[in-house]
Interface confidence: low
Amino acid sequence: HGTELPSPPSVWFEAEFFHHILHWTPIPNQSESTCYEVALLRYGIESWNSISNCSQTLSYDLTAVTLDLYHSNGYRARVRAVDGSRHSNWTVTNTRFSVDEVTLTVGSVNLEIHNGFILGKIQLPRPKMAPANDTYESIFSHFREYEIAIRKVPGNFTFTHKKVKHENFSLLTSGEVGEFCVQVKPSVASRSNKGMWSKEECISLTRQYFTVTN
């Protein structure tokens, strides 16, 4: 009876900084009593560690058991379906889960106006789960970059793009007034990690913000 159940078709990680979620697709025709067992392997230890015996969701937060991801050789995970005394074969993630798989994000973007410039400050992510010494800037200590997209409202397609190498940036508005909306996508020049665009932050620029200088 050990392999009567079909295996989950696919298993994969979706991760942001200290937010490491394992996902899987359900087996076809699962019953109300079907659940999923999750196990984790840390490279270098080479033995599977059972994490959850019976998860009825299609994802599992593995952050707490992968806190050393940024200082390790990475992990693999596997999932199998369980229904009463029956269980499927394991489905294993097909790539190593390492720091390279983490999607980079920013915490937030703060905007203010000074003499016709939009001044931006990028707040780095500060996840509660992260150990005190494992800050974003200590793990990605060099070559942090940010792509800045600026949209003037109205006008969805009016773009300015620039790449900056600091958490502080300035945008010259060329004397225009109106609402400016800014988004930021982080990257690290020396790494292949994907970045996620931040939510849009907008600020209104009126004539009062311009100082006349001779």
Epitope: T158, M196, E200
Partner: nanobody, 126 residues
Framework: QVQLQESGGGSVQAGGSLRLSCGAS????????MGWFRQVPGKEREGVAV???????SYADSVKGRFTISKDNGKNTLYLQMNSLKPEDTAMYYC????????????????????WGKGTQVTVSS
């Protein structure tokens, strides 16, 4: 892993037509910005045409009325129909995509794509 593969490039006389295709695989996002960009050696890559997941399109001024971008969601294929081609359209043409939530609105000035194809060469002779 997201993969983009262009095809359909080639050589054509001025005034002729070509249809570029870009097969996309490895993604399940319903929200996307996909487009065609081109680059001439020694010059910056420039946007040609883009399409948003809601079907809205945007074109560079230099190709408006001549080029048409479309996407077949069933086949997961992006197209660029290029008519009335001019010698100045000669370039390497790249398919690109930005996927997922929170991305900025699609625009031809938007070079912030996450995924790029390897390109297909278009040569227009006078």
């Amino acid at each position: 892993q997201v993969q983009l593969q262009e095809s359909g490039g080639g050589s054509v006389q001025a005034g002729g037509s070509l249809r570029l295709s870009c097969g996309a695989s490895g993604y399940t996002y319903s929200s996307y910005c996909m487009g065609w960009f081109r680059q001439v050696p020694g010059k910056e890559r420039e946007g040609v045409a883009v399409i948003d997941s809601d079907g809205s399109t945007s074109y560079a001024d230099s190709v408006k009325g001549r080029f048409t971008i479309s996407k077949d969601n069933g086949k997961n294929t992006l197209y660029l129909q290029m008519n009335s081609l001019k010698p100045e359209d000669t370039a390497m043409y790249y398919c690109a995509a930005d996927l997922g939530h929170y991305r900025p609105p699609c625009g031809v000035l938007y070079l912030g794509m996450d995924y790029w194809g390897k390109g297909t060469q278009v040569t227009v002779s006078s």
